[in-house]
Interface confidence: low
């Protein structure tokens, strides 16, 4: 009952004489494991013993597998899925059919199987896709309907006999639906592998030759194109006549049309395989080629560069660099169109030739504002010599030149002047664009190229100014010759070097810091009073009325600087002194009488001795004597003395009277 | 780097004397003028006094002429403000200040500023 | 001498505002005019210097405009660290003065 058998296996196996063949069979028997199996050859089923007769190949029943009588036959399988078989080796006579005998417990099949084995190995099959186009990747595929556990083989690729480099990928397969073994190979063809020979070649493990497959290629291309010309240098002169023909070695499928291209563009009404260019002109130099066109597009020919040579056009002449800084180098180039270069060149500086410029290129090292100007060339060949060109202008950059810092004040400048300098310069380029002025004083630039100084110190600064374009250019320093009034005027005592005493020899001197001009004038004062006009005042004996306030004032064409005012300080011992009496010098007794002592001295006094008409020292030695109370034996002349630390000096005598009381008169 | 550092502030009564120096590095100090700026607490910016590159020239505000001297050592790259018979109003951060090439440029460069305070 | 007015004395703004400060000049000063900014604590820093010219290393969102006696000094985005007060200052002449200043703050 084939409802209750499902079996799955490749329909027919191939394979030739002495190889082997591995037959992948599954199966499944619904009632139960199987109990028996018989490999029949060409099984025949006979109706009167309801058996099948046939070459058994192999058998095997639930007592265990009863030995065949070669071991060439083998089955794989297993009582309820696997029904795998082996033949190795297999023989030409086991073509045919397999039959698989299978039994369960209760039902019986019979699974017939072909096996196609040849007397010698078949040949593989080339697979090629419908349509090859040149350097397009294809894959090209070959297949042969065979693979066996038992017996390796190989697949090769030959391209005319040559093994080919490509690297193929070979696969096998050995399932229940398929059995192949198939190698496939990547290749980018070119179109001089057109109409060429590609085998596949099967071989045994040891590379030893089986079979093989062929086939021609068929490589679409586009033309392959060959182009000649004449003359074959491809240099001719203007008028000459130009022939150049295109040859197509191959083209897959033909071609269709036929043109030809200059410098890439396409030339109008040439369509045929010759080009002739009669009397040529300059402007027909170039790249040539032809351009033929099939079903897969046009080809093109090598290129093929046609001169036509001409004398020099007119030149131009470029300068590297322009603007050029002055010092710097330059290089002119003379340009002009000409074929064959030029091979000789005139220069030309404002019209004038430059003797012994006879390069293509002139290099100054060294670049001067003279170098400035036009500058252009003519060009020569073997053809004829060029026209001048209109020429280029070299501008030649430059500090400033011949800076100077002038003062715009009228002289001389006086200290506090506001004063005025301006930067002039005799020629720049580029244009002065700043100033700048040294030293960078906190100064005002009312305008560009002037400065202006207010309230100008004393102390005659050196000024200098640069004109800057790209470049600052200082000029040299210039005096300001301030002139100022004298300065630090100041009284200075030159003798004696100690204190002053009264009779000293004395000097006093005007010293001052500096003046300019330096003619000065002194002039000495004392309280208001002009004294001297030297720059000394001397005392060949000085006296205390000396003494007092003294200024010296030194002036010059510019003004008069006052020193401040000096103390002259004299020093004597006491003089004048004299001894006065309060009340009077007649006192009643009993009353108070004060006695001073009166004294000019400097320092003053230090120390008084009061003496009495008997020239006798009294206990007193301050400035003042006080009775009290007066006696009449007190009166009498009395004289001081006081002392400072020059000296000491004396009073005259003074009496004081001293009467009696009315109340003393009326006890009498 | 251009770089302005003043010091010598400090406490001091009025009537005293203080010195105030600037130490410059960085730059060409005898090119330049320089200047000396005070801000008194919580007010803004006063000019004191400047000085040219030589040190020929010097410039007082009103309020200072007369008791500050400016001055400078271009040996020693160092700027200095001498401040006599000191008042209460002068106190203040005193900054000093690099003047741009001929005062083109305003005051382009600051010190951080040094402290004086005068009080009783 | 000659004296600098600065307007408004505080200006309130908020980040990308554009800010604009005035400075007024007793008598003509042509261009002679700088701006500085200061933070505080800090040392003032130079903006701007004849009026218009950008100092070197400053941002190109300050500009300065004017001559004569009327000055400006713009923020064209103010940014978070454009916080700080402005001062305008004459260099025409000696003495040397300063605008009162301008404190731009956060609104």
């Known amino acids: 009952d084939s409802s209750k058998w499902v079996f799955e296996h490749p329909e027919t196996l191939y394979a030739w004489e002495g190889a082997c063949v591995w037959i992948p069979c599954t199966y499944r028997a619904l009632d139960g494991d199987l109990e028996s199996f018989i490999l029949f050859h060409n099984p025949e089923y006979n109706k009167n013993t309801s058996k099948f007769d046939g070459t058994r190949l192999y058998e095997s029943t639930k007592d265990g597998k009863v030995p065949s009588e070669q071991k060439r036959v083998q089955f794989l399988g297993d009582k309820n899925k696997n029904c795998t078989l082996s033949i190795h080796p297999v023989h030409l006579n086991d073509s045919g059919q397999l039959g698989l005998r299978m039994e369960s417990k209760t039902e019986k099949w019979m699974e017939r199987i072909h096996l196609n084995v040849s007397e010698r190995p078949f040949p593989p099959h080339i697979q090629l896709p419908p349509e090859i186009q040149e350097s397009q990747e294809v894959t090209l595929t070959c297949l042969l309907n065979f693979s066996c556990y038992g017996y390796p083989i190989q697949l090769q690729w030959l391209l005319e006999g040559v093994p080919m480099r490509q690297a193929a990928v070979t696969s096998t397969s050995l399932t229940i639906k398929s059995v192949f073994t198939r190698s496939e190979l990547k290749f980018s063809p070119q179109w001089s592998h057109h109409g060429k020979i590609v085998t596949c070649q099967l071989q045994d493990a040891d590379g030893k030759f089986l079979s093989n497959d062929t086939v021609q290629l068929n490589v679409k291309h586009t033309p392959k194109l060959e182009i000649k010309v004449t003359p074959s240098d491809a240099i001719v002169r203007e008028g000459d006549s130009v022939t150049m023909t295109c040859e197509v070695s191959s083209s897959n499928p033909e071609y269709t049309t036929v043109s030809w291209l200059k410098d890439g563009t396409s030339l109008k009404k040439q369509n045929t395989f010759t080009l002739n260019l009669r009397e040529v002109t300059k402007d027909q130099s170039g790249k040539y080629c032809c351009q033929v066109s099939n079903d897969v597009g046009p080809g093109r020919s090598e290129e093929v560069f046609l001169q036509v040579q001409y004398a020099p056009e007119p030149s131009t002449v470029q300068i590297l660099h322009s603007p050029a800084v002055e010092g710097s180098q330059v290089e002119f180039l003379c340009m002009s169109l000409a074929n064959p270069l030029p091979t000789n060149y005139t220069w030309y500086h404002n019209g004038k030739e430059m003797q012994g410029r006879t390069e293509e290129k002139v290099h100054i090292p060294k670049i001067l504002p003279w170098h400035a100007g036009t500058y252009s060339c003519v060009a020569e060949n073997i053809l004829g010599t060029g026209q001048r060109g209109p020429g280029a202008e070299l501008d030649v950059q430059y500090p400033p030149k011949k800076v100077t810092t002038v003062i715009q004040n009228p002289m001389p400048i006086r200290e506090g002047d506001t004063v005025t300098l301006s930067c002039n310069y005799n020629s720049s380029n580029p244009s002065v664009t700043r100033y700048e002025w040294k030293p960078h004083g906190a100064w005002e630039e009312p305008s560009l190229g002037v400065l202006k100084i207010q309230n100008v110190g004393w102390d005659n600064t050196t000024i200098a100014c640069a004109a800057c374009n790209s470049w600052c250019s200082w000029a040299s320093p210039v005096a300001l010759n301030v002139q100022y009034a004298p300065r630090d005027v100041r009284v200075r005592k030159i003798k004696p070097l100690s204190e002053i005493h009264s009779g000293n020899s004395v000097s006093l001197q005007c010293d001052f810091s500096s003046s300019h001009p330096k003619e000065v004038q002194f002039f000495w004062e004392k309280n208001g009073r002009l004294l001297g006009k030297e720059s000394q005042l001397n005392f060949d004996s000085i006296s205390p009325e000396d003494a007092g306030s003294y200024s010296c004032w030194v002036n010059n064409s510019i003004g008069q600087t006052a020193s401040k005012a000096w103390t002259l300080e004299v020093l004597y011992a006491p003089r004048r002194l004299r001894v006065s009496m309060s009340p009077g010098d007649q006192v009643m007794e009993g009353k108070s009488a004060t006695l001073t002592c009166e004294s000019d001295a400097n320092p003053p006094v230090s120390h008084y001795t009061w003496f009495d008409w008997n020239n006798q020292s009294l206990p007193y030695h301050s400035q003042k004597l006080r009775l009290e109370p007066v006696k009449v034996q007190h009166s009498g002349a009395y004289w001081c003395q006081g002392t400072n630390s020059v000296g000491k000096g004396r009073s005259p005598l003074s009496t004081l009277t001293v009467y009696y009381s009315p109340e003393t008169i009326g006890r009498r | 780097e251009v770089q302005l550092l003043e010091s010598g502030g400090g406490l001091v009564q009025p009537g005293g004397s203080l010195r105030l120096s600037c130490a410059a590095s960085?730059?060409?100090?005898?090119?330049?003028?320089m200047s000396w700026v005070r801000q008194a607490p919580g007010k803004g910016l006063e000019w004191v006094s400047a000085?040219?590159?030589?040190?020929?020239?010097?410039y007082y505000a009103d309020s200072v002429k007369g008791r500050f001297t400016i001055s400078r050592d271009n040996s020693k790259n160092t700027l200095y403000l001498q401040m006599n018979s000191l008042r209460a109003e002068d106190t203040a951060v005193y900054y000093c200040?690099?003047?741009?090439?001929?005062?083109?440029?305003?005051?382009?460069?600051w010190g951080q500023g040094t402290t004086v305070t005068v009080s009783s | 001498d000659i004296q600098m007015t600065q307007s408004p004395s505080t200006l309130s703004a908020s980040v990308g505002d554009r800010v604009t400060i005035t400075c007024r000049a007793s008598?003509?000063?042509?261009?002679?005019l700088a701006w500085y900014q200061q933070k505080p604590g800090k040392a003032p820093k130079l903006l701007i210097y004849?009026?218009?010219s950008l100092e070197s290393g400053v941002p190109s969102r300050f500009s300065g405009s004017g001559s004569g006696t009327e000055f400006t000094l713009t923020i064209s985005s103010l940014q978070p660290d454009d916080f700080a007060t402005y001062y305008c200052?004459?260099?025409?002449?000696?003495?040397?003065?300063f605008g009162g200043g301008t404190k731009v703050e956060i609104k």
């Open positions: 200040a690099k003047v741009g090439i001929s005062s083109l440029h305003g005051m382009d460069v």
């Open positions: 960085g730059f060409t100090f005898s090119s330049y003028a």
């Open positions: 000085i040219s590159g030589s040190g020929g020239s010097t």
């Open positions: 008598q003509s000063i042509s261009s002679w």
């Open positions: 004849k009026a218009s």
């Open positions: 200052q004459q260099y025409e002449r000696f003495p040397w003065t």
